[in-house]
């Protein structure tokens, strides 16, 4: 039985050219997290964090994606094309798969909201 819940940064915004942290947190379960996958809006993989083998960043993103903090992901040098949905998928044992969603809006304006505590100035 899956008892866990995923908490995410929800809807966040950041400035073009800036950086942002995407963060998910799995709670209310004792399940072992074996892997966390981060996907972009088109469901292409950005990164994988395997519990035993560590981080793997998709080659096309290696200059703009940094692992962490924790199981989160830092996106750098943001462009308008980065606007959209991001998904964290927690693969766990014995529960199975948990999935969280974050919506990132990249703003041209310098008045980008600093709404999320995970945001990097």
């Amino acid at each position: 039985m899956m008892t866990g819940t995923i908490e995410t940064t929800g809807n966040i915004s950041a400035k073009k050219g800036g950086s942002v942290i995407l963060q998910c947190h799995l709670s209310s379960t004792m399940a072992q997290v074996t892997q966390v996958n981060w996907e972009q809006h088109d469901h292409s993989l950005l990164a994988i964090r395997n519990a035993e083998l560590g981080w793997h960043i998709y080659p096309a993103f290696k200059d703009r994606v940094a692992p962490g903090p924790g199981l989160g992901l830092t996106l750098q040098s943001l462009t308008m094309n980065d606007t959209g949905e991001y998904f964290c998928t927690y693969h766990t044992y014995p529960d199975g798969t948990y999935r969280g969603r974050i919506f990132l809006e990249v703003l041209e304006s310098s008045v980008a909201e600093h709404s999320a505590r995970f945001q990097i100035p």
Epitope: T34, N37, H43, L45, P59, H91
Partner: antibody, heavy 121, light 108 residues
Framework: QVQLVQSGAEVKKPGASVKVSCKAS????????IHWVRQAPGQGLEWMGI????????SYARKFQGRVTMTRDTSTSTVYMELSSLRSEDTAVYYC??????????????WGQGTMVTVSS | EIVMTQSPATLSVSPGERATLSCRAS??????LAWYQQKPGQAPRLLIY???TRATGIPARFSGSGSGTEFTLTISSLQSEDFAVYYC??????????FGGGTKVEIK
């Protein structure tokens, strides 16, 4: 050319251990994962685990945890798979295969010739 | 774990005909899917990776398609050397990486 050469066939008694070697040549040994896959007679392919030859990090299928150990010797570009507490169901051909670069993930593009392990009393 | 299901288990095709093999993942694997060919007494051989990219030296008659959970391997015109067992495999979540049960392509 790129190749993986495995050790020869083995016959073991139930309860014993077997250690199969896989020698890589023709490429930068530490840069690619090595996987172990087995195939029982007349059956499909079963993934056993993976080793990062650069760091020695391993990840094993839950089914084999506690019975399998994968190690490497970077000086000879050789990976080893040891399976203990053998039973008749472990009778199979054991393959090593090269996976993707250790910075990302990938399909198994180069396979060893296979090592037949027979467990019989 | 991600379960890979292949269909059909056996496919009977005449030489020169088209063969279509299916593979379904129990959850999305994006395009991180490979196809392998295995002949009796031999090690598997990589045919397709990234769901649709042919491996080095693989003839153009082999093509892969699909993304997410549904994938297809097509052999446009079967040659005598193509009769074999074909396996799909996801390589995005481990442990364990998982293979399908295989599809045997036999001569009709």
């Amino acid at each position: 050319q790129v190749q993986l050469v495995q050790s020869g066939a083995e016959v073991k008694k139930p309860g014993a251990s077997v250690k199969v070697s896989c020698k890589a040549s023709g490429y930068t040994f530490p840069a690619y994962y090595i996987h172990w896959v087995r195939q029982a007679p007349g059956q499909g392919l079963e993934w056993m685990g993976i080793i990062n030859p650069s760091l020695g990090l391993t990840s094993y299928a839950r089914k084999f945890q506690g019975r399998v150990t994968m190690t490497r010797d970077t000086s000879t570009s050789t990976v080893y798979m040891e399976l203990s507490s053998l039973r008749s169901e472990d009778t199979a051909v054991y393959y090593c295969a090269r996976g993707g670069r250790t910075t990302w993930i990938g399909a198994l593009d180069i396979w060893g010739q296979g090592t037949m392990v027979t467990v019989s009393s | 774990e991600i379960v890979m299901t292949q269909s059909p288990a056996t496919l009977s095709v005449s030489p020169g005909e088209r063969a279509t093999l299916s593979c379904r993942a129990s959850q999305s694997v994006s395009s991180n899917l490979a196809w392998y060919q295995q002949k009796p007494g031999q090690a598997p051989r990589l045919l397709i990776y990234g769901a649709s990219t042919r491996a080095t030296g693989i003839p153009a008659r082999f093509s892969g398609s699909g993304s997410g959970t549904e994938f297809t391997l097509t052999i446009s015109s079967l040659q005598s050397e193509d009769f074999a067992v074909y396996y799909c495999q996801q390589y995005v979540v481990w442990p364990p990486l998982t293979f399908g049960g295989g599809t045997k392509v036999e001569i009709k």
